[in-house]
């Protein structure tokens, strides 16, 4: 496939990536699937600069990112290494809280109203951000 050189309509370009900001809410798994169907992934935050960019666009609203620990270890959806990567948890987070009474702990990460991260119940219908890299080969077949 050919390399994508510009962002799709309604996506925002920033530092060689394209971002799409939802205005409705979905459970984390549904948001993850939505991004995949767009040949993208839930946003992976790799720097303070990217954190500020996303934070500016989402405002003070709980918003899913591509980070979860549903299988135990914290994992970014694109394979970026959690251990060595950027982190911006709220103080006292993540806490895998069980007190919500919905079953299980808290396995999915989201931006909170101040931009810092919290782990929460993955079924909560939060907004989400999709990201795709501009230099990633698109899935469209080459023209013959």
């Amino acid at each position: 496939g050919s390399e994508r050189t510009c962002c799709p309509v309604n996506w925002v370009e920033h530092e060689r990536s394209c971002y799409w900001f939802s205005r409705s809410g979905k459970a984390w798994a549904d948001a993850d699937n939505y991004c995949r169907l767009e040949d993208a992934h839930l946003v992976v935050v790799t720097s303070w600069e990217e954190q500020k960019f996303v934070q500016h666009h989402i405002g003070p609203v709980n918003t899913w990112m591509g980070l979860h620990d549903q299988n135990g270890p914290w994992k970014w959806v694109d394979g970026t290494d959690y251990e060595t990567g950027f982190k911006n948890w709220r103080p006292e987070q993540p806490d895998d809280w069980y007190g919500h009474g919905l079953g299980g702990g808290e396995d999915c990460a989201h931006f909170t109203d101040d931009g810092r991260w919290n782990d929460d119940v993955c079924q909560r219908p939060y907004r989400w951000v999709c990201e795709t890299e501009l230099d990633k080969a698109s899935q469209e077949p080459p023209l013959l």
């Epitope: 135990g72 959690y82 299980g104």
Partner: antibody, heavy 114, light 107 residues
Framework: EVQLVESGGGLVQPGGSLRLSCAAS????????MNWVRQAPGKGLEWVSS????????YYADSVKGRFTISRDNAKNSLYLQMNSLRDEDTAVYYC???????WGQGTLVTVSS | DIQMTQSPSSLSASVGDRVTITCRAS??????LAWFQQKPGKAPKSLIV???SLQSGVPSKFSGSGSGTDFTLTISSLQPEDFATYYC?????????FGGGTKVEIK
């Protein structure tokens, strides 16, 4: 490589105390809940206690509540279990584990006997 | 507290056999179930979480299924290294509880 290494086990008399430690390495310790699980000789696994990554939430099995105290030092990447008023039935191998049990230490044997 | 009942408590099987172990919860635990393998003198090893998600590095001969109260662990073709004791554990709510274990022995 993720590693958990328990220490502090040994022989103690009924009513005595012991402090177990679990040294963690290879991961961001403060991002993970940690657990203590024990196994009496020839028996199955029994969950003992859990603590959230930043010390905000702690849970205990009824069998140890009021006698055992779980704690952690994120600066030292260490998990602890303070065991007081020990009973014969506390004799077991004690394991520390991470999150949903994705990794475990090798265990440390605690024997309560007079 | 949620009780976890595993069956059978032990079974004898031959190399190459398909083995199924069941775990029943006393109440709905969604898919918050893990399976562990333990060999004598060793620490437990995580095989499956979230009822059916295979842990990294675990061979695909292991599979898990179920939701709600009834769960199964299947070993598609038993190998010599698979003879061990298997435990289920619910993490839907505290206190966390384990099944009593299933010992898989050589026939």
């Amino acid at each position: 490589e993720v590693q958990l290494v328990e220490s502090g086990g040994g022989l103690v008399q009924p009513g005595g105390s012991l402090r177990l430690s679990c040294a963690a390495s290879g991961f961001t310790f403060s991002s993970y809940s940690m657990n203590w699980v024990r196994q009496a000789p020839g028996k199955g696994l029994e969950w003992v206690s859990s603590i959230s990554g930043r010390n905000t939430t702690i849970y205990y099995a009824d069998s140890v509540k009021g006698r055992f105290t779980i704690s952690r030092d994120n600066a030292k990447n260490s998990l602890y279990l303070q065991m007081n008023s020990l009973r014969d039935e506390d004799t077991a191998v004690y394991y520390c584990s991470r999150d949903r049990g994705s990794c475990w230490g090798q265990g440390t044997l605690v024997t309560v006997s007079s | 507290d949620i009780q976890m009942t595993q069956s059978p408590s032990s079974l004898s099987a031959s190399v190459g056999d398909r083995v199924t172990i069941t775990c029943r919860a006393s109440q709905d635990i969604n898919n918050y179930l893990a399976w562990f393998q333990q060999k004598p003198g060793k620490a437990p090893k995580s095989l499956i979480v979230a009822a059916s998600s295979l842990q990294s590095g675990v061979p695909s001969k292991f599979s898990g299924s179920g939701s709600g109260t009834d769960f199964t662990l299947t070993i598609s073709s038993l190998q010599p290294e698979d003879f061990a004791t298997y435990y289920c554990q619910q993490y839907n709510s505290y206190p966390l509880t384990f099944g009593g274990g299933t010992k898989v022995e050589i026939k």
